[in-house]
């Protein structure tokens, strides 16, 4: 039996629509918006849950304009071309022909063009910095309970391998989680840097995407971690394009 | 299809040992973790210990010091080494395996399970 099995639904991504209709009555769940069959005992990637963000009624959804903080995610929510295994298509285009080539974790990585542009590859995005500023609290927690906490929370709530999360620095009120996985290093089933990073990103503010879990609880030591601001900074295993233009702007 | 088969269980005094086995068939990639869980009559199945494809291990703060988890993965077999055994031990163990490498306890990262073996701990 699986976790999903019990009453058909998808413990892990509550953007499904579940029916017992897989091999031999099991249930099986499918992404809104793309109707891709999911594996429920394991992250969703980025780009259906984006597809299925995208495919909500407008006024089932809440908060979809990115932070005003977002840096790197400007170009903040879009309808994404997925491949048959579920990642970021390397081109983007939207409805008006304007295309642009993405990393695996579906940021923009060169400037929009047309319909000619083309995007030999996907590019891998192999270290995540996640930037947090906690609220301000009686005194600094302690790096070391901080860093265990950070950590068992990838490894059990994202199912991220502990040696993908290479480091947890701490200057308050500034937290900065580093995440790395090369290429080399993913393997079938291991659950991808960049997808953990987003669930992490919607718990933090508040639409966690997990069915009938409570949401983030962060504590360190039994005191509470109330994240006001987040950042996230994709470093690509090749290095983006854009013209000077925009690196003047 | 994966197959998982407990073995091992039993009563035994606080303070004793046992030691399971769980027999893994059907799988064609040795990439998949695996774990112990219990549950415990009118309780929530929790997990107990966990073993990934590195043979990394994590544990039940409760159980740390007292139970082993090890795999032998020529023979597909995984084990629980239970010492000083407690009559709060007592409860039905699962084995359990996850596609891929990880190390959790949340039972919702594994998508196969056995049927469970009996232990009971008498005070």
């Known amino acids: 039996h699986t976790a999903a099995q019990d009453n058909c639904t998808c413990p892990t991504n509550k953007m499904t629509v579940c029916s017992p209709d897989g091999p031999g009555g099991r249930c099986q769940c499918r992404a809104l918006g793309s109707g891709m069959a999911v594996d429920c005992s394991t992250l969703t990637s980025k780009c259906l849950l984006l597809k299925a963000r995208m495919s909500a009624p407008k006024n089932a959804r809440t908060l979809v304009r990115p932070s005003e903080h977002a840096l790197v995610d400007n170009d903040g929510l879009y309808d994404p071309d997925c491949d048959p295994e579920g990642r970021f298509k390397a081109r983007q285009c939207n409805q008006t022909s304007v295309c642009w080539c993405v990393n695996s974790v579906g940021v923009r990585r060169t400037d929009k063009g047309d319909l000619s542009l083309r995007c030999d590859e996907l590019v891998r995005t192999h270290h995540i910095l996640i930037d947090l500023r906690h609220r301000p609290t009686a005194g600094a927690f302690n790096h070391s309970d901080l860093d265990a906490e950070l950590r068992r929370l990838f490894r059990e709530r994202y199912r991220l391998h502990p040696k993908f999360v290479a480091a947890v620095h701490y200057e308050q009120p500034t937290i900065q989680i580093e995440l790395r996985q090369n290429t080399s290093q993913k393997a079938a089933g291991d659950v991808d840097i960049g997808d953990a990073a987003y669930y992490f990103e919607r718990d933090i503010k508040g639409e966690s995407l997990f069915q009938g879990r409570g949401g983030l609880d962060l504590r360190v030591r039994g005191e509470p971690l109330q994240v006001e601001r987040t950042l996230i900074y994709y470093l690509d295993e090749i290095p983006p394009k854009f013209s000077m233009k925009r690196l003047t702007a | 299809q994966v197959q998982l088969q407990e073995s091992g269980g039993g009563s035994v005094q606080a303070g004793g040992s046992l030691r399971l086995s769980c027999v893994v068939s059907?799988?064609?990639?040795?990439?998949?973790?695996m774990a112990w869980f219990r549950q415990a009559p009118g309780k929530e199945r929790e997990g107990v210990a966990g073993?990934?494809?590195?043979?990394?291990?994590t544990y039940k703060p409760s159980v740390e010091g007292r139970f082993t988890i090890s795999r032998d993965s020529a023979k597909r077999t995984l084990y629980l080494q239970m010492n000083s055994l407690k009559p709060e031990d007592t409860a039905m163990y699962y084995c359990a395996t996850g596609t891929g490498n990880f190390l959790a306890l949340d039972p919702v990262w594994y998508n196969t399970w056995g049927q469970g073996t009996q232990v009971t701990v008498s005070s």
């Open positions: 059907g799988y064609t990639t040795t990439r998949y973790s």
């Open positions: 073993i990934d494809t590195d043979v990394l291990t």
